[in-house]
């Protein structure tokens, strides 16, 4: 009488998460009487996957009808495979008894599960930085298997080279995670720029996953200030304008100072946007020259995005002709008690 053999023909089987796996097993003899069981892993800690004798295993079915005695095929289907199902599966024949006695095990079939990486999530710095500074972006993707994966960084379509990538864990696992940090040097033109993290994996069939981040969230372009005056039609009035150029983001507070004293404060509104994504804004004062005859310094002070204020000063120029137009009744001290009229545009 030939000795019973348990044959598992495949050394390994690979399936994609969500699909079904078929694990094949045949026996060369039905003698002695006793159940066939499937286990994941070997040794005392092995996990029972299917017992053809009894039990409720909702994800496992036999390939052929187990009630046909002359059927020596004990192959099983496992449905809805997840990465947690990875491992080596053993088909084991027992002799009926109390307890059942293990007679022979198959050589085992290693089930590897191909699992897609999650959509890459790109996160930028917590604080904004100014042009010429370097900022870091992090890209994370999880739950993929096998471990081999390729990650690339792009800025506006151009591949970046300054990045560091780690795949965890280092050892064998049911699934893996990748984390990569790229260093990007900001320029003044980066308000409209975008960084892209691209992940390629065997499960994606050549169609990589991408995660993006906008540099607009990471950059602060400080404004440049210019203050100038222009005469008005009324001979005793001049327009003093503060031109705030090329700033990002929009948040801006402007204060006019008259010889160091706060004259008025306003928040930027009605901005004009430049092609590069930065903004311009201008604020102006209508100054009565008769109230300000000599030595008045007007200062435009700008606080941008919560940063320390920058300022630009302008000494008010009053011509001899304008002075002549002022009657004695309108002349007064250098710091006129009445605040000058202001405006913005």
């Amino acid at each position: 009488e030939e000795e019973l053999q348990v044959i598992q023909p495949e050394k390994s089987v690979s399936v994609t998460a969500g699909e079904s796996a078929t694990l094949n097993c045949t026996v060369t003899s039905l003698i002695p009487v006793g159940p066939i069981q499937w286990f994941r892993g070997a040794g005392p800690g092995r996990e029972l996957i299917y017992n053809l004798k009894e039990g409720h295993f909702p994800r496992v079915t036999t390939v052929l009808d187990p009630t046909k005695r002359n059927n020596m095929d004990f192959s099983i289907h496992i449905s809805n495979i997840t990465p947690a199902d990875a491992g080596t599966y053993y088909c084991v024949k027992f002799r009926k008894g109390s307890p059942d006695v293990e007679l022979k095990s198959g050589a085992g079939t290693e089930l590897s599960v191909r699992a897609k990486p999650s959509a890459p999530v790109v996160s930028g710095p917590t604080a904004r930085a100014t042009p010429e500074h370097t900022v870091s972006f992090t890209c994370e993707s999880h739950g993929f298997s096998p471990r081999d994966i390729t990650l690339k960084w792009f800025k506006n379509g151009n591949e970046l080279s300054d990045f560091q990538t780690n795949v965890d864990p280092a050892g064998k696992s049911v699934s893996y995670s990748i984390r990569s940090t790229a260093r990007v040097v900001l320029t003044r033109r980066d308000v409209h720029s975008q960084v892209i993290c691209e992940v390629a994996h065997v499960t994606l069939q050549g169609d990589p996953l991408r995660g993006t981040a906008n540099l607009s969230e990471a950059i602060r372009v400080p404004p440049t200030l210019e203050v100038f005056q222009r005469p008005m039609r009324a001979e005793n009035q001049v327009n003093v304008t503060c031109q705030v150029r090329k700033f990002y983001p929009q948040r801006l507070l402007l204060t006019w100072l008259e010889n160091g004293n706060v004259s008025q404060t306003e928040t930027a509104s009605t901005l004009t946007e430049n092609k590069d994504g930065t903004y311009n804004w201008r604020s102006w004062l209508l100054v009565n020259t008769c109230a300000h005859r000599d030595g008045v310094v007007l200062t435009c002070q700008v606080e941008h995005d919560g940063q320390p204020a920058v300022s630009k000063s302008h000494a008010l120029e009053v011509s001899a002709h304008q002075k002549e137009q002022c009657s004695d009744t309108t002349s007064g001290p250098v710091l006129a008690p009445t605040a000058p009229l202001g405006g913005s545009g």
Partner: antibody
Framework: EVQLVESGGGLVQPGGSLRLSCAAS????????MHWVRQAPGKGLEWVSA???????YYTGSVKGRFTISRENAKNSLYLQMNSLRASDTAVYYC????????????WGQGTMVTVSS | DIQMTQSPSSLSASVGDRVTITCRAS??????LAWFQQKPGKAPKSLIY???SLHSGVPSKFSGSGSGTDFTLTISSLQPEDFATYYC?????????FGQGTKLEIK
């Protein structure tokens, strides 16, 4: 349809012999462990004998040496040769198929009556 | 030989009742226990194998449990056709042995 049909029962004197037959249909008898179970009038069930797929045979103590179980694959039939019959062997004899993994009984014949009496 | 003891030997119940029959083995039989139903003048019918698995076509009102030496058969809601004699059987080792039977009668 899977079916077992017994025959060969009847009245026999003590010390006499009888051969019971069980014809199987709807399955291959040689692929299963097969059994004989009996039930004396008004009594419970008693397992009598079995034959395994390899031809190995088993008997309950009271019939050992007197009864012989066998099968004929060509006829898909099971037999029980009963010799030296006693009054205590009087019973309905059932042919039973053992189940797939563990030999649990699944299919029963309708039974044949054996009466041992003088 | 392994002795099988059923209790009670007889039981009176009404239609709709839930009844439980117990079976005890004289030694550990793992879960190699079967239950059979027999009506007068008929061959036994296989109900349950490996203590809790229902044979094909057996209604789910029948359920079995237990392992080792103590086992139960439960019929959840008795119907007229369920009044019969029930037997347990061990089949872990030869000679296979049956319990003495439990006669379930209508009250």
């Amino acid at each position: 349809e899977v079916q077992l049909v017994e025959s060969g029962g009847g009245l026999v004197q003590p010390g006499g012999s009888l051969r019971l037959s069980c014809a199987a249909s709807g399955f291959t008898l040689s692929s299963y462990d097969m059994h004989w179970v009996r039930q004396a009038p008004g009594k419970g069930l008693e397992w009598v004998s079995a034959i395994g797929t390899a031809g190995d045979t088993y008997y309950t103590g009271s019939v050992k040496g007197r009864f012989t179980i066998s099968r004929e694959n060509a006829k898909n039939s099971l037999y029980l040769q009963m010799n030296s019959l006693r009054a205590s062997d009087t019973a309905v004899y059932y042919c039973v198929r053992g189940g797939v993994w563990d030999d649990a009984f699944d299919i029963w014949g309708q039974g044949t009556m054996v009466t041992v009496s003088s | 030989d392994i002795q099988m003891t059923q209790s009670p030997s007889s039981l009176s119940a009404s239609v709709g009742d839930r009844v439980t029959i117990t079976c005890r083995a004289s030694q550990d039989i793992n879960n190699y226990l079967a239950w059979f139903q027999q009506k007068p003048g008929k061959a036994p019918k296989s109900l349950i194998y490996t203590a809790s698995s229902l044979h094909s076509g057996v209604p789910s009102k029948f359920s079995g449990s237990g392992s080792g030496t103590d086992f139960t058969l439960t019929i959840s809601s008795l119907q007229p056709e369920d009044f019969a004699t029930y037997y347990c059987q061990q089949y872990v080792s030869y000679p296979y042995t049956f319990g003495q039977g439990t006669k379930l009668e209508i009250k």
